[in-house]
């Protein structure tokens, strides 16, 4: 019968008795940087080419016995998970292996850097189709390794890495912390985060998504027909490398940004029990388990967006946090969040020719996060319109006045320390959805975009009594681009997008002890692109 992990990543329409996806990733080459491998295992023979690259440190210990099957164990298993004939994800993908880990599974930053340079040179000498690089390894944070990953990603290579098995914030490790890399955490057959002894999968904002990573059956280097179960974020990353190979084989022109957005879009949502993660990491960790798309074609018509969290600003009074989108993505909205509720909002600002999302801490605050909504919007022309704090009691408002521009997001930023505690609510006048509204003491920023066929609408959900969380979701066919809170009298901790749902968090009612603090309204801006839909229909 089909192994649980292959069943889990397979959409229902492909599920027969056996795992037989429509295309095996045959147009894609996957580079594996790992241990040596047993290339004559029948699961991978003829699919994996062992390069002559080897850069590994000496094994520790005087009594270490180098046993071939042990040296090959990790790499052989991962090669099998990616492209194995029987238990592999992308059964048609070809692989090349580089040895950067020794028989104890240890490597060096320099060895990995030289390995990445080897791939870059190979790509220049003999350009092939799409390339996926699998980095099933994790070490301490390394600026130089992250920079090397960035260079390779910007050269058009898709890098997939393990989040790490330290039950820790993945941002503390490399290459997991490199923004350009697709970072993968591990889940089990129950869609729960994988526990490995006293440790387990890493988590946090640097993780892009999770994938099966416990009891994964794959080729064993023990013998030519042997299989074995292994667990960890390396196995999870191998699944995503395989899925990426399948997607790229079906659509070879996909950019890294497009691929990442599709991986996120087609993932299973909200299936992971977040209680396993530390409380402060739950909101930052994506609740996504990777899956193959239900069809390898026809996804082009959708407007894809993802949420990008910044690093924590730190608690100093003037501290700020910045969230950035990938080079090919548009920043369509910006929001902020603070656990203490002490923040001075957020704004979109230009930095290096690109918009970024900056959140501001307030005096006495424990720090803030900036949350960017990053979308794929071809031929977009976006700008930010700002209204300074208003004198009038009606509050500050700003709209998209340019012809053909639509509102995709609202942000507000204020200088006063404790805005919103006892201010009267501001109501948006009916029939004027294309504008942002805020406190009169706040400056309001509207993200306005023009793109072929782009249409957006505002959707609100207000709750009269105070609630810790208020949500509003975009309906089928529409994509959430903006998420904010209508200024009310309740103490809002912030707003952020989770998949297609806008979440507004307020201070815990039980801690405020008051029930008279009034309404909380979540405001979602939902968009779609008729142009993308038409283009997709024409292609078919």
């Amino acid at each position: 019968s089909i192994p649980w992990n292959l069943e889990r990543i397979t959409p229902p329409r492909y599920r027969a008795d056996e795992y037989q996806p429509p295309d095996g990733g045959s147009l894609v080459e996957v580079y594996l940087l790992d241990t040596s491998i047993q290339s004559d295992h029948r699961e991978i023979e003829g699919r994996v080419m062992v390069t002559d690259f080897e850069n590994v440190p000496e094994e520790d210990g005087t009594r270490f016995h180098r046993q071939a099957s042990k040296c090959d164990s990790h790499g052989t298993h991962l090669a099998g998970v990616v492209s194995g004939r029987d238990a592999g994800v992308a059964k048609g993908a070809s692989m090349r292996s580089l040895r950067v880990l020794n028989c104890q599974g240890k490597g060096t930053v320099s060895g990995t850097l030289i390995g990445l340079e080897f791939i870059r040179k190979s790509q220049l000498v003999q350009p092939v189709g799409p390339l996926v690089v699998l980095l099933p390894l994790a070490g301490g944070y390394s600026r130089v390794l992250n920079a090397a990953c960035q260079r390779l990603a910007r050269a058009g290579v898709v890098l997939v890495t393990a989040a790490g098995n330290f039950r820790d914030d993945a941002c503390l490790y490399s290459p997991a912390s490199a923004p350009e890399v697709i970072t993968v955490g591990a889940t089990n057959a129950q869609d729960q985060p994988v526990t490995l002894g006293t440790l387990g999968t890493n988590f946090g904002r640097c993780v892009d998504l999770f994938a099966p990573g416990e009891d994964i059956i794959g080729a064993s280097s023990d013998c030519s027909t042997c299989f074995v179960s292994q667990s960890g974020t390396s196995q999870a990353a191998a699944h995503v490398a395989g899925i990426a190979a399948m997607m790229l084989s079906a659509e070879p022109e996909l950019t890294l940004a497009e691929l990442r957005q599709r991986l996120i879009h087609f993932s299973a949502k909200d299936v992971i029990n977040e209680a396993w993660f530390p409380e402060d990491q739950r909101v930052l960790t994506p609740n996504l388990v990777a899956a193959l798309p239900p069809s390898t074609h026809g996804a082009g018509w959708q407007l894809f967006c993802r949420t990008v969290w910044s690093a924590h600003s730190g608690p100093t009074r003037m501290a700020t946090a910045v969230a950035r989108c990938a080079p090919d993505e548009e920043l369509l909205s910006c929001s902020s969040f603070s656990r203490s509720g002490k923040r001075r909002g957020e704004r979109m600002e230009a930095q290096g020719g690109k918009l970024v999302c900056r959140a501001h801490n307030a005096f006495g605050g424990e720090g803030v996060y900036a949350i960017a909504r990053c979308c794929l919007l071809p031929q977009a022309n976006c700008s930010v319109h700002t209204a300074p704090p208003a004198e009038a009691s009606m509050g500050t408002r700003v709209h998209c006045h340019q012809q053909g521009h639509v509102l995709t997001g609202c942000s507000s930023h204020w200088e006063v320390e404790d805005l919103g505690t006892h201010k009267p609510p501001v109501l948006r006048p009916r029939g004027q959805p294309n504008q942002c509204v805020g406190h009169r003491e706040a400056s309001i920023h509207a993200s306005c975009c023009h793109a072929p066929g782009l249409e957006c609408k505002v959707k609100e959900h207000g709750i009269p009594a105070p609630q810790e969380q208020v949500t509003v979701a975009c309906e089928e066919g529409w994509t959430l681009t903006g998420c904010s809170a209508l200024p009310g009298t309740s103490h809002v901790l912030g707003a952020y997008a989770v998949d297609n749902t806008c979440v507004v968090r307020s201070r815990d009612v039980s801690t405020t002890g008051s029930t008279s603090e009034g309404a909380v309204t979540a405001v979602a801006i939902c968009c779609r692109s008729r142009h993308l839909a038409q283009a997709s229909q024409e292609l078919q």
Epitope: D17, E18, Q20, D40, R42, E43, E45, G46, S73, R85, D86, A87, K91, G92, I217, S220, D222, C223, S224, T225, C226, F227, V228, S229
Partner: antibody, heavy 119, light 113 residues
Framework: QVQLVQSGAEVKKPGESLKISCKGS????????ITWVRQMPGKGLEWMGM????????RYSPKFQGQVTISADKSISTAYLQWSSLKASDTAMYYC????????????WGQGTLVTVSS | DIVMTQSPDSLAVSLGERATINCRSS????????????LAWYQQKPGQPPKLLIY???TRESGVPDRFSGSGSGTDFTLTISSLQAEDVAVYYC?????????FGQGTKVEIK
Amino acid sequence: QVQLVQSGAEVKKPGESLKISCKGSGYSFTDYYITWVRQMPGKGLEWMGMIYPGDSYTRYSPKFQGQVTISADKSISTAYLQWSSLKASDTAMYYCARDYWSKPFFDVWGQGTLVTVSS
Amino acid sequence: DIVMTQSPDSLAVSLGERATINCRSSQSVLYSSNNKNYLAWYQQKPGQPPKLLIYWASTRESGVPDRFSGSGSGTDFTLTISSLQAEDVAVYYCQQYSSFPITFGQGTKVEIK
């Protein structure tokens, strides 16, 4: 039910070519390996090689490498064993059998094809 | 190549009596990663293809009578027919399926005494 059906007995002269077949039914043909086993008159079983019809990956025993060719046509769920130039010593019963990645032993066998090579 | 050696070459046993066939591999077919012995036993009756009896050294194939049992580990294995029946007259082969080329023992012919 699951079965492997082999082509009928063949009588050939030395130097002639031959292609015998093994058709699978009752299971997903591309997910199983097909192996060929030789049994010379009054002798034991010898593994010749195998094919994975899913991608036509083949592996041969060193003894038979270059002597025979194993192939498959997954569209008709059939595997083949062929010789380009038969020898008298190729006279034997040839069996096909299947195996699966998690069960790499031969659970289903064809009925056998007797090949006689004589001048 | 892993060499499989069976003993005896032939065996004559009375009906209802125990028949024991031994098989030795030139290297271990037990693998630590899954703790399995990659060894199978087959029965071949005259004019018929071989039939799988035992796999993983000791697991009986479905439909095989429980008088057939397999034991052993590493390099030494045994097939036991606890109470020989007339229909058990055949040649029995052991086979390792862990390393290529896959190899069989030379066979043990079981007859009725």
